[in-house]
């Protein structure tokens, strides 16, 4: 349905409030380095203009695209060369390429300071002062630090931030009431930014297809009563409201994704029957709510899928009828009857009966040739059970933070070439799927651990992709989307990797170490270990085991002594010293 | 080709026991779901009990919890109807059947269980 | 328990009537509805699963409509083979619940 002003359309759908968050969100996204007062103006001209648009939809320049409009004013950024350097050159180009090179350039590690959290006491003045700017900041701060940050949750995230203020700020122990709740909302927050990240990637590096075929895959493990019909529709709803907020075209993502969220409520019968508590909630909550929601259960007697999809004599007739659909119905099928199965699992086993069907459709005996195909089915499956099995009693014997460092020692000698911090990160967040995912029953392991670790791998893909080093990384990354994790699982030490220089530099520690909080520590040390496997990669566990003892028991003590500095000194060259020899370094 | 036969009915007391079997073959995957259906003397279809045959889950109607209990033996392809505390309403034709609701659907010819004084 | 209510419980037609047999379910089933045919001394036969779709072998005068919550089976043309018992069952929550029957005789 066309309208004669997109803005003023635009508008009218969300109102003030969600459009003027969302262009905010949007312009933070895109030029991430730009102060929030600038955003705020810009924003500002923008929401006028739009209010011109609703009272006269004829007005001069109504009738302009949502990227023209936005990428125009983008562009009278004075000081764009001079902070972006060659994103400047997207302002030479047209519609829709200028919004393709403003993409190009999001930059999903950007060089910025690391948010500090304030005293509670500031924050909540801050806030009563002006409710309105401090929320805004908010939403400009996780939008520029995140650009591919889903925008209608962000709402949802920045509604939830303003309730704990509004809370908090009155109750009689701020901090005990404001922090943990602060704290949930940013390790969700970084949760919700890596998935939908991969959602993004899915989409611009492997395209549409692949990205219908997680959510048929999702969304029939979620909702395994909807008939296929009615999955596809949604599948297909889905796609376009993460195209739209992918390509950066937030308000309509918003628009689209609250249509979804109506008429999924108003079709639950013939949906789900877990959404009854969703759909109570208003917009934001239910859409959350929605897209969180547990799995309904099965319906009862789901017959056997060999008969329509081995021993049926149409198999080949209705593959070359139509491929896509048939295999989007064997997703379907096999997806609502495993939600014990990863998305990513269930779809290496379609894209396995793809491959039979595309080999065997095409020979003497068809039925001869794929009459086994769910015997292919057998390791596939047993390959993520078994390294979920021995991961899982790993994290159990080790606990998270020496789970970590097995990871980080694992991953640093496949690719040894990937930055210290990169490993660090990607390490740490690999090693949470212990206490993510272990705790569940086995029919809950697979799907939470596999398809965390798709998001996590993600996220080392994003990074090496900016900067890449690795040629193995790029491999794994680029290959298959579905077979990442397999691909990283199956990398061997890197033979070819030179050793790094030894530097003392690296390994030197000061007072402040002291006054760091835990996880700072951790993350200080778990540096230092990356550190020493790129100069020893062939060291054995036991080899650095011993080291980061030592390391833990030289932190521990200096941390006590009274002079902690000149402990840091004198006993940190003796550490050093012995580590070299115990690492033959 | 997919077989069932049913065996194990008979005539027992109130308050007795009666295992029935449904031996299978033709199988060629275990991803399907095999149930008993009754039917008592001149009155309509009841379903009785369902279990899954790859994971062993069970379903049963809720006038049978406690009384009845359905396995299998997948080594046998042999489904099973352990019926305990057996009322006079419990007699009936018991069949058992493979997909009751698809086109891999299959029934036995049943059998008879008649619990009587 | 979700129950199924089957209408009329008994019918006599002539060779060659249109027959409809309807089946209310007491809440919504989506598509999860079959309907059997069991004639005397014999096993139930599946006419139709997923409440439209034609089993293999099942003459095209029978037919299937309706989701949600009401459903029809349709013989287009009634043979003197078609004398039988004919029941509806719900399969999307256990337990699954069979219509009490509907018997369609010639007059």
């Known amino acids: 349905d066309a309208h004669k002003s997109e803005v003023a359309h635009r508008f009218k759908d969300l109102g003030e409030e969600n459009f003027k968050a969302l262009v905010l969100i949007a312009f933070a996204q895109y030029l991430q380095q730009c102060p929030f007062e600038d955003h705020v103006k810009l924003v500002n001209e923008v929401t006028e203009f739009a209010k011109t648009c609703v009272a006269d939809e004829s007005a001069e320049n109504c009738d302009k695209s949502l990227h023209t409009l936005f990428g125009d004013k983008l562009c009278t950024v004075a000081t764009l060369r001079e902070t972006y350097g060659e994103m400047a050159d997207c302002c030479a180009k047209q519609e829709p390429e200028r919004n393709e090179c403003f993409l190009q350039h999001k930059d999903d590690n950007p060089n910025l300071p690391r948010l500090v959290r304030p005293e509670v006491d500031v924050m909540c003045t801050a806030f009563h002062d002006n409710e309105e700017t401090f929320l805004k900041k908010y939403l400009y701060e996780i939008a520029r630090r995140h650009p591919y940050f889903y925008a209608p949750e962000l709402l949802f995230f920045a509604k939830r931030y303003k309730a704990a203020f509004t809370e908090c700020c009155q109750a009689a122990d701020k901090a005990a009431c404001l922090l943990p709740k602060l704290d949930e909302l940013r390790d969700e927050g970084k949760a919700s930014s890596a998935k939908q990240r991969l959602k993004c990637a899915s989409l611009q590096k492997f395209g549409e297809r692949a990205f219908k075929a997680w959510a048929v895959a999702r969304l029939s493990q979620r909702f395994p009563k909807a008939e296929f019909a009615e999955v596809s529709k949604l599948v297909t709803d889905l796609t376009k409201v993460h195209t739209e907020c992918c390509h950066g075209d937030l308000l309509e993502c918003a628009d689209d994704r609250a249509d979804l969220a109506k008429y999924i409520c108003e079709n639950q019968d013939s949906i789900s029957s877990k959404l009854k508590e969703c759909c109570e909630k208003p917009l934001l909550e239910k859409s959350h709510c929605i897209a969180e929601v547990e799995n309904d259960e099965m319906p009862a007697d789901l017959p056997s899928l060999a008969a329509d999809f081995v021993e049926s004599k149409d198999v080949c007739k209705n593959y070359a009828e139509a491929k896509d659909v048939f295999l989007g119905m064997f997703l379907y099928e096999y997806a609502r009857r495993h939600p014990d199965y990863s998305v990513v699992l269930l779809l290496r086993l379609a894209k396995t009966y793809e491959t039979t069907l595309e080999k065997c459709c095409a020979a003497a005996d068809p039925h001869e040739c794929y009459a086994k195909v769910f015997d292919e089915f057998k390791p596939l499956v047993e390959e993520p059970q078994n390294l979920i099995k021995q991961n899982c009693e790993l994290f159990e014997q080790l606990g998270e933070y020496k789970f970590q460092n097995a990871l980080l020692v694992r991953y640093t000698k496949k690719v040894p070439q990937v930055s210290t911090p990169t490993l660090v990160e990607v390490s740490r967040n690999l090693g949470k799927v212990g206490s993510k995912c272990c705790k569940h029953p086995e029919a809950k392991r697979m799907p939470c651990a596999e398809d965390y670790l798709s998001v996590v791998l993600n996220q080392l893909c994003v990074l090496h992709e900016k900067t890449p080093v690795s040629d193995r990384v790029t491999k794994c990354c680029t290959e298959s989307l579905v077979n990442r994790r397999p691909c990283f699982s199956a990398l061997e030490v890197d033979e070819t990797y030179v050793p790094k220089e030894f530097n003392a530099e690296t390994f030197t520690f000061h007072a402040d170490i002291c006054t760091l909080s835990e996880k700072e520590r951790q993350i200080k040390k778990q540096t230092a270990l990356v550190e020493l496997v790129k100069h020893k990669p062939k060291a054995t566990k036991e080899q650095l085991k011993a080291v980061m003892d030592d390391f833990a028991a030289f932190v521990e003590k200096c941390c006590k002594a009274d002079d902690k500095e000149t402990c840091f000194a004198e006993e940190g060259k003796k550490l050093v010293a012995a580590s070299q020899a115990a690492l033959g370094l | 080709e997919l077989q069932l036969v049913e065996s194990g009915g008979g005539l027992v007391q109130p308050g007795g026991s009666l295992r029935l079997s449904c031996a299978a073959s033709g199988f060629t995957s275990d991803d399907f779901v095999m149930h008993w259906v009754r039917q008592a003397p001149g009155k309509g279809l009841e379903w009785v009990s369902a279990?899954?045959?790859?994971?062993?889950?069970?379903y049963y109607a809720e006038s049978m919890k406690g009384r009845f209990t359905i396995s299998r033996d997948n080594a046998k392809n042999t489904l099973y109807l352990q019926m305990n505390s057996l009322k006079s309403e419990d007699t009936a034709v018991y069949y058992c059947?493979?997909?009751?609701?698809?086109?891999?659907?299959?029934w036995g010819q049943g059998t008879q269980v008649t619990v009587s004084s | 328990d979700i129950v199924m209510t089957q209408s009329p419980s008994s019918l006599s037609v002539s060779l060659g009537d249109r027959v409809t047999i309807t089946c209310q379910a007491s809440?919504?089933?989506?598509?999860?509805l079959a309907w059997y045919q069991q004639k005397p001394g014999q096993t139930p036969k599946l006419l139709i699963y997923?409440?439209?779709r034609l089993q293999t072998g099942v003459p095209s005068r029978f037919s299937g409509s309706g989701s949600g919550t009401s459903f029809t089976l349709t013989i287009s043309g009634v043979e003197a083979e078609d004398v039988a018992t004919y029941y509806c069952l719900q399969h999307l929550t256990y337990p699954l619940t069979f219509g009490q029957g509907t018997k369609v005789e010639l007059k």
């Open positions: 279990i899954r045959w790859d994971d062993g889950s069970t």
């Open positions: 809440q919504n089933i989506i598509s999860y």
């Open positions: 997923g409440a439209s």
């Open positions: 059947a493979k997909s009751v609701s698809a086109s891999s659907n299959y």
